[in-house]
């Protein structure tokens, strides 16, 4: 596999990483945090090794920024529970919230 | 503790909708999801969907989509499930049970006492 | 849709005996299955979740292990109560569903 195809898949994977942050900020739906984390990272890896790569720096970033604010360990633990759900290839339907719309 | 107390049996004619009811007592109504289950002789224990009982939507089995639609009362504790245009297929017994937490995957430790659905002409 | 497929379909056994049931999965579900007891006339009623981990009130000789696609609920010494039938379920994605069902009846 090149570098290039590599770099191509990253670019998809930090996009599909977006997209899951910015529905799940206009769904603003109770419990479907762990949901888009999972779903996030499930359509990244799904791109590959570049996406998978890409998901993991991003989550790590994220992270880092909300420990920086003060967001509890806790809740840390398990968006890191469901990031890793999501980049090892399970469904994230897992954790989604009953009524949630199906757009997402 | 926890009861949940579904509505009596309905005998109804084909093309008709009926509504069952729900309701829970025991714990914080809008903690936990509703889920709906059928249990006919042909198809044992199936799915039919779930009301997220904080914000009042439902999500269905595909299979259930324009058959089933749950709604919510939340000064009552109540969960309904209308089915429409009835027919012999829907003869069964409608369960409700409550989820393990407000997301759809879940296992159920509560049920209803079922509501027995006959449809005949 | 993950099919449940459960064996036997029905089972013939003695008060004191022992029995496996088993219930297969069409695609991996991890540890994320369910056991149902119920009786004629009454709703299913919870036995185990997670696979293995036995619900609040269960007795000791029920006990459920498998992961992946392959389960199995076991009871020890089989009492009168015991008899009735039996559902696996999923909670892994959606839809949720459930087994195929046994039926154990008293020989």
């Known amino acids: 596999r090149s570098f290039f195809s590599f770099l191509g898949e990253a670019f998809d994977g930090a996009r599909d990483m977006w997209r899951a942050y910015s529905d799940m900020r206009e769904a603003n739906y109770i419990g479907s945090d762990k949901y888009f984390h999972a779903r996030g990272n499930y359509d990244a890896a799904k791109r590959g090794p570049g996406g998978a790569w890409a998901a993991e720096v991003i989550t790590d970033a994220r992270e880092n920024i909300q420990r920086f604010f003060g967001h509890g360990a806790e809740d840390s633990l398990a968006d890191q529970a469901a990031n890793e759900w999501g980049r090892s290839g399970k469904d994230p339907n897992h954790f989604r919230p009953a009524g949630l719309p199906e757009k997402y | 503790q926890v009861q949940l107390q579904q509505s009596g049996a309905e005998l109804v004619r084909p093309g008709v909708s009926v509504k069952i009811s729900c309701k829970g007592s025991?714990?914080?109504?809008?903690?936990?999801?509703m889920h709906w289950v059928k249990q006919s002789h042909a198809k044992s224990l199936e799915w039919i969907g779930v009301?997220?009982?904080?914000?009042?939507?439902?999500s269905y089995n595909q299979k259930f989509k324009g058959k089933a639609t749950m709604t919510e009362d939340k000064s009552s504790s109540t969960v309904y499930m209308e089915l429409a245009r009835l027919t012999s297929e829907d003869s069964a017994i409608y369960y409700c049970?409550?989820?393990?937490?407000?997301?759809?995957?879940?296992?159920?430790?509560?049920w209803g006492q079922g509501t027995l659905v006959t449809v005949s002409a | 849709d993950i099919q449940m497929t459960q064996s036997p379909a029905s089972l013939s056994a003695s008060v004191g005996e022992t029995v496996t049931i088993t219930c297969r999965a069409s695609?991996?579900?991890?540890?994320?299955l369910a056991w149902y007891q119920q009786k004629q006339g009454k709703s299913p009623q919870l036995l185990v979740y997670?696979?293995?981990t036995l619900a609040e009130g269960v007795p000791s000789r029920f006990s459920g292990s498998g992961s992946g696609t392959q389960f199995s609920l076991k009871i020890n010494s089989l009492q009168p109560e015991d008899f009735g039938s039996y559902y696996c379920?999923?909670?892994?994605?959606?839809?949720?569903?459930f087994g195929t069902g046994t039926k154990l009846e008293l020989k």
């Open positions: 049970a409550r989820g393990s937490s407000l997301m759809i995957t879940s296992w159920f430790a509560y």
């Open positions: 025991g714990y914080t109504f809008t903690d936990y999801a």
């Open positions: 009301i997220n009982t904080y914000y009042g939507d439902a």
């Open positions: 695609e991996n579900i991890y540890s994320y």
């Open positions: 997670n696979a293995k």
């Open positions: 379920q999923h909670h892994y994605g959606t839809p949720l569903t």
